[in-house]
Amino acid sequence: AVNGTSQFTCFYNSRANISCVWSQDGALQDTSCQVHAWPDRRRWNQTCELLPVSQASWACNLILGAPDSQKLTTVDIVTLRVLCREGVRWRVMAIQDFKPFENLRLMAPISLQVVHVETHRCNISWEISQASHYFERHLEFEARTLSPGHTWEEAPLLTLKQKQEWICLETLTPDTQYEFQVRVKPLQGEFTTWSPWSQPLAFRTKPAALGKDT
């Protein structure tokens, strides 16, 4: 039997993926569990197998269609259930009526590249992946730069309050190795959260020009 606290959290990537995490204190051991998705106004339903990510936490991805297909809209409500097998029966462990565009977490930005680098400056661009056309320009970004001798957690956050897929980093030190990351968030949605950070982009500033011989 299961008592104790349970948490069931899901996010929509705005296109064709709902990612879910279910955690349960005193959870069923060696049990097969699934997430079932039943939209209120669509003919399809979908299932994914929950796989352990920690002692009492499981995760899975509901793949709703091709990565860039628009499978849900702002009016959809999807009933999500956690079902766990006990003998021959499926037990209903958790239920959530899920409004996809109130629970957004986009994919991490991709294709980071150095457009131009100088001694003290670096211009970097990126692209967003699998983001709905519904957002138009209603997105914001956060970026951070890893300097030598520091950690990512210490890096100050740079906020871009508009859909701007580039940044010009300034006041950099010449001939120095840096790393850069960016993440994205739609402005829409009560429970919307930041995407994961992008893969880090490593770059090196140009050396300072040598002074003339005297």
Partner: nanobody
Framework: QVQLQESGGGSVQAGGSLRLSCAAS????????MTWYRQGPGKEREFVSS???????TYANSVTGRFTISRDNANHTVYLQMNSLSPEDTAMYYC????????????????WGQGTQVTVSS
């Protein structure tokens, strides 16, 4: 056996208010997920609002800001406060209760009420 009893429907002028209630008898110690649906004349049944076993509330876009769902955990009753009603809200309103897993609980079973009629005239 689970019994659902809905009440609170009636006729009201546009702009008026009604409060629906749905009481689930039996298995009072079990965790439940309660949902209101409605079916207007010549329309398909549609989701209105729900309240989870954890208290999380969800509303259809068409009723957000006008309807409020709440529950009395002690006697497994859910309420739907409907304000600023319009003729488009005219429908039969149904309550659905779904039980979650627990010792002696009828999990996996969904129970529907008979419905309560709401009529809004302009």
């Amino acid at each position: 056996q689970v019994q659902l009893q809905e009440s609170g429907g009636g006729s009201v002028q546009a702009g008026g208010s009604l409060r629906l209630s749905c009481a689930a008898s039996g298995y009072e110690y079990c965790r439940i997920h309660m949902t209101w649906y409605r079916q207007g004349p010549g329309k398909e049944r549609e989701f209105v609002s729900s309240i989870g076993s954890d208290g999380r509330k969800t509303y259809a876009n068409s009723v957000t800001g006008r309807f409020t769902i709440s529950r009395d955990n002690a006697n497994h009753t859910v309420y739907l406060q409907m304000n600023s009603l319009s003729p488009e809200d005219t429908a039969m309103y149904y309550c659905k209760t779904e039980y979650l897993y627990g010792l002696g609980c009828p999990d996996g079973s969904a129970y529907w009420g008979q419905g309560t009629q709401v009529t809004v005239s302009s």
